[in-house]
Amino acid sequence: QQQTLPKPFIWAEPHFMVPKEKQVTICCQGNYGAVEYQLHFEGSLFAVDRPKPPERINKVKFYIPDMNSRMAGQYSCIYRVGELWSEPSNLLDLVVTEMYDTPTLSVHPGPEVISGEKVTFYCRLDTATSMFLLLKEGRSSHVQRGYGKVQAEFPLGPVTTAHRGTYRCFGSYNNHAWSFPSEPVKLLVTGDIENTSLAPEDPTFPDTWGTYLLTTETGLQKDHALWDHTAQN
């Protein structure tokens, strides 16, 4: 006999990186017929939604109208059908950005390199932080972590055209509170025999960085179903 229901999906709209004082929506998608959804924050109950009518709703939205460092952290959700509860969702790491200062991002040997050259990014922030994050624009929003007292280096190794793109970095005051983003640095990789043209990102995936930038510039909500940056199994 089944003791739990399948875990729901959790994600943040428009992005898991939220500028301070901006709005974010945490979405939890379970099953039609779920009579209750619970959102947990750092292990404690945060909010409850009992959708009506439950048989016509399989997703609920929990609004956070004013993002701040107290609201940054790990969220998960569960749902209930009858008396049976689901497994908890994966953890959603909600990050508050635009805290305190702006780092400087530089690249060595320069922003235009030949395929196969070793490239290193440097992120510098003079205020008290020891962790830095490097993000590349595009659909993956892959985050690289680096450490240093005022500067971290991010060696990319020998680069290929796959490394082309626009990079930004953040200083991190803790896992869920980041600085303003640095100015962008565009890396151009040339000399690849097979393909020297800039290949566009896969258009079937949303550009999560672009969505984040829209949030920072306008504070608007976009109805994008952006999955949380941890893998959903």
């Epitope: 709005q23 929506t25 924050f41 404690s44 109950l45 945060f46 909010a47 409850v48 939604d49 009992r50 959708p51 009506k52 609920v60 939205k61 929990f62 609004y63 956070i64 109208p65 004013d66 107290r70 609201m71």
Partner: nanobody, 130 residues
Framework: QVQLVESGGGLVQAGGSLRLLCAAS????????MAWFRQGPGKDREFVAA????????YYADSMKGRFTISRDNAKNTAYLQMNSLRLEDTAVYYC???????????????????????WGQGTQVTVSS
């Protein structure tokens, strides 16, 4: 901006009842989920009960379930907490709170965590004596 003012507190004997009121100013109150919290002497602030903006959904802390009832009258911009079968351990300052007013909240959502609340009243003292 939403301003909240609690009233109705006082001294009551164990087993007695009190009805707390939370009067709100501000046009958006009727669209905001709200809640009651309390802080007893030497204790942390704790969740008591929450209600959706529509009044159609409520949620209670386990120790208050069956004894306390939260309600609201949006036409009067007022929320209520009816407290019955009061116990000595219910002695506390009771606060009403409302969430931030820039989001289109679901009519069935309630928030149980104090960090979700942007607006707070000054509190009203409830003392339960033996």
């Amino acid at each position: 901006q939403v301003q909240l003012v609690e009233s109705g507190g006082g001294l009551v004997q164990a087993g007695g009842s009190l009805r707390l009121l939370c009067a709100a100013s501000g046009r958006t109150f009727s669209r905001l989920p709200m809640a009651w919290f309390r802080q007893g002497p030497g204790k942390d602030r704790e969740f008591v009960a929450a209600i959706s903006w529509s009044g159609g959904s409520t949620y209670y802390a386990d120790s208050m379930k069956g004894r306390f009832t939260i309600s609201r009258d949006n036409a009067k911009n007022t929320a209520y907490l009816q407290m019955n079968s009061l116990r000595l351990e219910d002695t506390a300052v009771y606060y009403c709170a409302a969430v931030g007013d820039s989001a289109p909240y679901s009519a069935t959502i309630v928030y149980t965590d104090a960090r979700a609340y942007a607006y707070w009243g000054q509190g009203t003292q409830v003392t339960v004596s033996s």
